[in-house]
């Protein structure tokens, strides 16, 4: 009978194992090993026995010792299971973006390592197994399927094979895959919200404010605003999970018409858009022309005003007839006239908005001088020694100067309180003069004695 | 002046129906003319409008749905496919007017027909 | 655009008492809004014009204020032949897709 020692070995590949043959007979005609292996005898041996150092063992052996005694032929083998780890450890890249709530596939290529039996791949997150299966194939594919949350932004994802041997060999074997980290992205199904003029007047500046709500990581979104191919250039405020891109628009004669207002919020790799029609216009002030801005009275004055061929005019809130972008009216110029307002309204629909615009403009009514016995009484009388004020007004447009003067000299204090003397009797002669002429009047003054009392 | 809507009746749905509108007293040209309805259980909704010069506009549910023309003493209202979600009374309403103190026209609905009623069923 | 919000969207109020009715604006409407009284089988019949204009043949029982985007309607002395439904209008725009009316207020006499 031939016996080996060790029966069975677990060493590493390219390791070395010292194997002994004996025979069950004390003289054995004749004692060995067969082996492909590298095999070297150490010396001395003993009469029934060899011992044999194999080298360089790179797979699974099965060396046999023989031996010939007086009693018969017999044969042993050992068995050589040769361990390593496995060459590859690999987790297949994750996608750029995952959104949340879809499953996420994660996928591990493992090549090499025996003995299989004993090798385990694991994925994880972080450092917590979320599958362990046993490694078939070469290359051995394992793949788990894994909810993904909020929660998972940013979490490291690795593989790990375990190459168990215990207890034979006391060491547990490891290797892990490089990790790969997450990013998850949360884009609601709703649009944006879009709130801009919906109509917007040439070189004017109109505000435009696109926000959404719901966004993970709200950090990581970007927004688009354009206003036809006018891009704009958003200030964007960040919520907890919202966001909100404020700009200032401005547009210019060529862009006049309908033009499409676009806000786009992209996550990971998604986009949620909002379009919206913005009509461009351009309306200036009506125009209030009057055939002479400054007449003589008496004179006919045409007031016309005139506005956008849409637009509807109301000349001093009587609107045009038809209604329509033109209204005049003719009047003959009064004193009553003279600083008069003229206002022009007019009223424009665009895209089914109305939007207003006023133009103003005043009459100058040139008249007089004026002397009239309502303003410039023709005859005082005054008790003498009483407190009066002679009063005499002067009308006209330019304003006139006035003079009232006794024989030429003495000037009757208009407009000033003064005690009533003897002297202040007599005909005055008030004067009223403008560049549009002049006109006089007599004024007499009155003075009454104490005696007549 | 006055409005007075005409066409409303029973239909059955997809099938086109028109109402009309005919305006006295006053010049379409010079107006702006609304249709409104009333659904039963309903509030007023506001359909669309057709300026003096022919220009439409429409609710956002309407769109597509209704068409609005008109003549020059009349204002039609086409129903393009009608379910029976349409069943309702529709008036039509003058909506245009002007403030003499700010000088601005405005939408107002100052007169009203006495509405028709549409029936829509299979 | 320009949404109307109306409230409350019922009250019940007893005769002789007062009711308020208010509408928010989604913007400014400057003054241009309109009170409508709409009872079934009639057209509705305009009370109110310019935010505070009573119409022509209506009972100054009725009050409209407000300007740029709240307002309000008031009904003093109610009487039973003020139960209706109540709706506010904006004068400012009839774009596409225009919000016109209020969603409404039924009046309830008690």
């Known amino acids: 009978q031939t016996s080996v020692f060790p029966p069975e070995v677990i060493l590493p590949r390219g390791g070395s194992v010292k194997v002994n043959c004996s025979a069950s007979c004390d003289q054995p005609i004749s004692l060995g090993m067969e082996t492909p292996l590298p095999k070297k005898e150490i010396l001395p041996g003993g009469n029934n026995w060899k011992m044999y150092e194999l080298s360089n063992v790179q797979e699974d052996s099965q060396p046999m010792c023989y031996s010939n005694c007086p009693d018969g032929q017999s044969s042993a083998k050992t068995l050589l299971t040769v361990y390593w780890t496995p060459e590859r450890v690999e987790l297949a890249p994750l996608p750029p973006w995952q959104p949340v709530g879809k499953n996420l596939t994660l996928r591990c290529q493992v090549e090499g390592g025996a003995p299989r039996a004993n090798l385990t791949v694991m994925l994880l997150r972080g450092e917590k197994e979320l599958s362990r299966q046993s490694a078939v194939g070469e290359p051995a594919e394992v793949t788990t399927t894994v909810p993904v949350g909020r929660d998972d932004h940013g979490a490291n994802f690795s593989c790990r094979t375990e190459l168990d041997l215990r207890p034979y060999v006391l060491k547990l074997f490891e290797n892990t895959s490089a990790p790969h980290q997450l990013q998850t992205f949360d884009l609601p199904a709703t649009p944006p919200q879009l709130v801009s003029p919906q109509v917007l007047e040439v070189d004017t500046q109109g505000t435009v404010v696109c926000s959404l709500d719901g966004l993970f990581p709200v950090s990581e979104a970007q927004v688009s605003l354009a206003l036809g191919d006018q891009k704009l250039n958003p200030t964007i405020t960040y919520g907890n999970n919202s966001l909100s891109a404020k700009a200032s628009v401005k547009v210019t004669a060529e862009e006049e018409g309908t033009q499409q207002l676009l806000c786009g919020v992209m996550l990971g790799n998604q986009t949620q858009e909002t379009r919206q029609t913005v009509t461009i216009y351009s309306f200036p002030a009506p125009n209030v022309n009057l055939t002479k801005p400054e007449v003589s009275e008496g004179t006919e004055v045409i007031v016309e005003c005139e506005a956008h061929p849409r637009a509807k005019v109301m000349l001093n809130g009587v609107p045009a007839q038809p209604p329509g972008p033109r209204a005049q009216f003719l009047l003959k110029a009064t004193p009553e006239d003279n600083g008069r307002s003229f206002s022009c309204s007019a009223t424009l629909e665009v895209a089914g908005q109305l939007v207003h615009k006023n133009q103003t403009r005043e009459l100058r009514v040139l008249y007089g001088p004026r002397l009239d016995e309502k303003d410039c009484p023709g005859n005082w009388t005054w008790p003498e020694n009483s407190q009066q004020t002679p009063m005499c007004q002067a009308w006209g447009n330019p304003l006139p100067q006035l003079k009232c003067l006794k024989d030429g000299t003495f000037p009757l204090p208009i407009g000033q309180s003064v005690t009533v003397t003897r002297d202040l009797e007599g005909t005055y002669l008030c004067q009223a003069r403008s560049t549009r002429g002049e006109v006089t009047r007599e004024v007499t003054v009155n003075v009454l004695s104490p005696r007549y009392e | 002046q006055s409005v007075e809507e005409s066409g409303g009746r029973l239909v059955t749905p997809g099938t086109p129906l028109t109402l009309t509108c005919t305006a006295s007293?006053?010049?379409?040209?010079?107006?702006?003319m609304s249709w409104v309805r009333q659904a039963p259980g309903k509030g007023l909704e506001w359909i669309g409008i057709?300026?003096?010069?022919?220009s439409t506009y429409y609710a956002s549910w309407a769109k597509g749905r209704f068409t609005i023309s008109k003549t020059s003493t009349t204002v039609d209202l086409k129903i393009t496919s009608p379910t029976t979600e349409d069943t309702a009374t529709y008036f039509c309403?003058?909506?245009?007017?002007?403030?003499?103190?700010?000088?601005?026209?405005?939408?107002?609905?100052?007169?009203w027909g006495p509405g028709t009623l549409v029936t829509v069923s299979a | 655009g320009y949404d109307m919000t109306q409230t409350p969207a019922s009250v019940e109020v007893a005769v002789g008492g007062t009711v308020t009715i208010k509408c928010q604006a989604s913007?400014?409407?400057?003054?241009?809004l309109a009170w409508f009284q709409h009872k079934p089988g009639q057209p509705p019949k305009r009370l109110i014009y310019?935010?505070?204009t009573l119409a022509s043949g209506v009972s100054s029982r009725f009050k409209g204020s407000g300007s740029g985007t709240q307002f309000t309607l008031t009904i003093s002395g109610v009487e039973s032949a003020d139960a209706a439904t109540y709706y506010c209008?904006?004068?400012?725009?009839?774009?596409?897709?225009?919000?016109?009316f209020g969603g409404g207020t039924e009046v309830v006499v008690k």
């Open positions: 309403a003058r909506d245009w007017s002007y403030d003499s103190s700010s000088g601005y026209y405005y939408y107002d609905m100052d007169l």
């Open positions: 007293g006053f010049s379409l040209s010079n107006y702006y």
């Open positions: 057709i300026s003096d010069s022919g």
């Open positions: 913007q400014s409407i400057n003054s241009w």
């Open positions: 310019k935010a505070s």
């Open positions: 209008q904006q004068g400012y725009s009839r774009s596409d897709g225009e919000h016109v």
